[in-house]
């Protein structure tokens, strides 16, 4: 399987890590988080061609039948591997509370 | 989160479970692989909008930046959330073999 | 901008064989996916096969296995089809037309002009 | 593999006039696309998945349909639309074009 820097679409077109700075109004979380005030979001972003990160097997037959009938079978998508943790300082009814997310920073990634 | 049968784009145009039927060729597996000649191979195929089967908050995020910025960010995407087993047939030196490949056939699905 | 040159024409005697090319530029050669259709006069399109230049996949239309042979010359971002054992059935305009395979659902975005072939003793 | 019908194979139309042309497939399939093609010219891409106009193609131009039947309408035509127009699938395999409907303009 082709490695994370081998992208034959050309650099950096194909499924890597990508950092976004959102602020607490775009993510929605105004009402609720104090802190922080903006988040530099890891996501996973970009194509995945034949053979690129392939998480399993499974990526590997959606690449074959995405190439037979491309209408019918998307390609496979590049979403998180694993996961970084991020604490966000919350509003609570009595104060403050420090609450730790898993599941909220992509860590790498990978194409199924 | 919507359930898998609130998809608010038109009936079975969200994420959800599709079979797809292929053969060994379709699949580049006729070299190596007996049995099953033909796979009838679930996948997960659909569109993600907006809290549709979203997996965790990272696909929360990831909705709420599509929007703001839908050129940089895609949309969650629709894949498996767990796998069924299947065996294979197997051609061997010697043979045949029975393997069971656990990431082959999506299960069921969510977005991220 | 996105270009696909082809030769304008090529003649050629029954049971030999031709090697058509296909040039592209304005775009990463093994980003897109390479088709290669059929016209005959005064009829409609026949697809023939397709080509990914990132690993050389090929995938041919059962009525052309054996007749048409994809290649690609990633060096010189040109694309190939040979057609083999050539009789006046083959005497058509051939083209050869780009694809985003990751930008489905797509159509075929970039044609070249097409290459008339003639199959004549 | 699907055989894609176009109907009517010849159209003729006036100026200003709305004109239907439609694809109907031997089987489902979940998208069509659209190619218009000028004598002595290659194919361009004119309608891409079902009614997604093709970058140029004037706004008088719709798509529509599902399931096993799609449709290319011309709100008003003009003479510049005197063409061939193909449909093709790939939801299946393999990709397959209809046989065209000749547009002609009186």
């Known amino acids: 399987a082709r490695n994370g820097d081998d992208c034959p679409l050309g650099p950096g077109r194909c499924c890597r890590l990508h950092t976004v700075r959102a602020s607490l109004e775009d993510l929605g979380w105004a009402d609720w988080v104090l802190s922080p005030r903006e988040v530099q979001v890891t996501m996973c972003i970009g194509a995945c061609p034949s053979q690129f990160r392939a998480a399993n097997m499974h990526a590997q037959i959606k690449t074959s039948l995405h190439r037979l009938k491309p209408d019918t079978v998307p390609a496979p998508c590049c979403v998180p591997a694993s996961y970084n943790p991020m604490v966000l300082i919350q509003k609570t009814d009595t104060g403050v509370s420090l609450q730790t997310y898993d599941d909220l920073l992509a860590k790498d990634c990978h194409c199924i | 989160a919507r359930n898998g049968d609130d998809c608010p784009l038109g009936p079975g145009r969200c994420c959800r479970l599709h079979t797809v039927r292929a053969s060994l060729e379709d699949l580049g597996w006729a070299d190596w692989v007996l049995s099953p000649r033909e796979v009838q191979v679930t996948m997960c195929i659909g569109a993600c909008p907006s809290q549709f089967r979203a997996a965790n908050m990272h696909a929360q995020i990831k909705t709420s930046l599509h929007r703001l910025k839908p050129d940089t960010v895609p949309a969650p995407c629709c894949v498996p959330a767990s796998y069924n087993p299947m065996v294979l047939i197997q051609k061997t030196d010697t043979g045949v073999s029975l393997q069971t490949y656990d990431d082959l056939l999506a299960k069921d699905c969510h977005c991220i | 901008q996105v270009q696909l040159q082809q030769p304008g024409a090529e003649l050629v005697r029954p049971g030999t064989s031709v090697k058509l090319s296909c040039k592209a530029s304005g775009y990463t050669f093994t980003s897109y996916w390479m088709h290669w259709v059929k016209q005959r006069p005064r009829q409609g399109l026949e697809w023939i096969g397709l080509i990914d230049p990132s690993d050389n996949y090929t995938n041919y239309n059962q009525n052309f296995k054996g007749k048409a042979t994809l290649t690609v010359d990633t060096s010189s971002s040109t694309a190939y089809m040979q057609l083999g054992s050539l009789t006046s059935e083959d005497s058509a305009v051939y083209y050869c037309?780009?694809?985003?395979?990751?930008?489905?659902?797509?159509?075929?975005?970039?044609w070249g002009q097409g290459t008339s072939v003639t199959v004549s003793s | 593999q699907i055989v894609l019908s176009q109907s009517p194979a010849i159209l003729s139309a006036s100026p200003g006039e709305k004109v239907t042309m439609t694809c109907r497939a031997s089987s489902s399939v979940n998208y069509m696309h659209w190619y218009q093609q000028k004598p002595g010219s290659s194919p361009k891409p004119w309608i891409y998945a079902t009614s997604n106009l093709a970058s140029g193609v004037p706004a008088r131009f719709s798509g529509s349909g599902s399931g096993t039947s799609y449709s290319l309408i011309i709100s008003r035509v003009e003479a510049e639309d005197a063409a061939a127009y193909y449909c093709q699938q790939w939801s299946s395999y393999p990709p397959t074009f209809g046989g065209g409907t000749k547009l002609e303009i009186k």
């Open positions: 037309a780009s694809y985003d395979g990751y930008s489905t659902p797509s159509a075929m975005d970039y």
